[in-house]
Amino acid sequence: FPQDRPFEDTCHGNPSHYYDKAVRRCCYRCPMGLFPTQQCPQRPTDCRKQCEPDYYLDEADRCTACVTCSRDDLVEKTPCAWNSSRVCECRPGMFCSTSAVNSCARCFFHSVCPAGMIVKFPGTAQKNTVCEPASPGVSPACASPENCKEPSSGTIPQAKPTPVSPATSSASTMPVRGGTRLAQEAASKLTRAPDSPSSVGRPSSDPGLSPTQPCPEGSGDCRKQCEPDYYLDEAGRCTACVSCSRDDLVEKTPCAWNSSRTCECRPGMICATSATNSCARCVPYPICAAETVTKPQDMAEKDTTFEAPPLGTQPDCNPTPENGEAPASTSPTQSLLVDSQASKTLPIPTSAPVALSSTGK
């Protein structure tokens, strides 16, 4: 490309720049020990320190640990990046009641709509389920298919939050009451799945790959490096990526040079206590004698609050013990008690949450 020659010549005459043939332009040469944040840096601000994997470069140019989503009730929402931490959120089926930097300090199960009520807004990772009274003439057992549809992809009924989050102006919050025996029996039937592969014991990124290379002649790769498991935060510090090494966690997104790893609970578990980019505590999906169904939507995206049921109705399901504790166990297919008479069991694949009705369908 003869027309590029003048540009190339001007680069050669300037020791602080080099010519990149790939992009056909002059690029700023990052000083020794710094690495570029883009393919062809144009100015000193395009160069950064590098951090170990799982660390990011923060605003003060320090490598800072990405948060870990290693708690049972958290999943990784965004990975550890060179300039930002991993972000954790409550795992599907739970919502955050106490937030923390880049994470959640406490997750609670989405509430189950009691008898006579249906889901208005499914729970998300940030909000509890919102329930509303079923349409007039609809029985608590959802006799009318039009008003109480069973979802095709579905969601599994979730335990009440403890405490229940404040209601919106259009819906009153109502805790689900009732015995805990069912949940305890169901939980006792859960069996642990074999550990699935996680990030334990292996580097989350190859320290020899491009972002961690020193700045070779004629290259723009001059960013600061971090050790594996650290990422470069916004201030240029190497920050620890969270760890998914607990038995009940799996890696959702890997530790990157500029963002933290994020973790989520293993299949069949949901996050009860979230942490930044991870989950502090995973518990098995609770099962409830559900006379309620939820409309098909991603449970991790919305959460559950109640509108008052019609007079005379009583919520009758509390899928987990009052203290919210449940054994940390999973299984690829869990045989779970569905009704309070213990007359039926229903295998529930953990790959996709399902909604249960009192008929066991």
Partner: antibody, heavy 120, light 107 residues
Framework: QVQLQQSGAELAKPGASVKMSCKAS????????MHWVKQRPGQDLEWIGY????????DYNQKFKDKATLTADKSSSTAYMQLSSLTSEDSAVYYC?????????????WGQGTLVTVSA | DIVMTQSHKFMSTSVGDRVSITCKAS??????VAWYQQKPGQSPKLLIY???TRHTGVPDRFTGSGSGTDYSLTISSVQAEDLAVYYC?????????FGSGTKLEIK
């Protein structure tokens, strides 16, 4: 298993330099970054800095930027630290250490330490 | 730099006792705290990281806890071999920093 074998004790005069080594075995040397830590007698531990043996990238604690120089030799799986312009303040045990990525954020593996004594 | 403060230089205990060693960070370190045990003439040994995760092979009598700026290492039932200096370290941000150490003495 992972082992870090450090070189023997050094006796040096003020103003001189010393270079100590840390030979790694039991893992792929270029996979883990090597950290160096200083411990003065009866005192706490201080992080000096680290090197990525795969790329020779180094980063230092500001306090040691003009004191320590970290290098690595991939062919012998050995990391080195050179201390320059020695004073009595540099008399200490120096450790090399590394993490175990994916399952440990602390320094899981340590060398046995190299004692440096600076004396006229 | 983040300063890690171990307020007790020495702690005296008896075999079988429960003891807690504390560490305070000068700023929130988001549970990125490790604990080490160093016996006389030996290198430090990693016990705990991420405030509460026990390192491989560490006896379960060692437990770490804490959040924000306050952290502790608890030995549920002290054994004679636990005589050592215990250091906390923040692995949250470079430069990584250590506490000044707490020497555990057996009565």
């Amino acid at each position: 298993q992972v082992q870090l074998q450090q070189s023997g004790a050094e006796l040096a005069k003020p103003g001189a330099s010393v270079k100590m080594s840390c030979k790694a075995s039991g893992y792929t040397f270029t996979s883990y970054w090597m950290h160096w830590v200083k411990q003065r007698p009866g005192q706490d531990l201080e992080w000096i800095g680290y090197i990525n043996p795969s790329t020779d990238y180094t980063d230092y604690n500001q306090k040691f930027k003009d004191k320590a120089t970290l290098t690595a030799d991939k062919s012998s799986s050995t990391a080195y630290m050179q201390l320059s312009s020695l004073t009595s303040e540099d008399s200490a045990v120096y450790y090399c250490a590394t993490r175990h990525y994916g399952s440990s954020y602390g320094f899981a593996y340590w060398g046995q330490g190299t004692l440096v004594t600076v004396s006229a | 730099d983040i300063v890690m403060t171990q307020s007790h230089k020495f702690m005296s205990t008896s075999v079988g006792d429960r003891v807690s060693i504390t560490c305070k960070a000068s700023q929130d370190v988001s549970t990125a705290v490790a604990w080490y045990q160093q016996k006389p003439g030996q290198s430090p040994k990693l016990l705990i990281y991420w405030a509460s995760t026990r390192h491989t092979g560490v006896p379960d009598r060692f437990t770490g806890s804490g959040s924000g700026t306050d952290y502790s290492l608890t030995i549920s039932s002290v054994q004679a071999e636990d005589l050592a200096v215990y250091y906390c370290q923040q692995h949250y941000r470079t430069p990584f920093t250590f506490g000044s150490g707490t020497k555990l003495e057996i009565k």
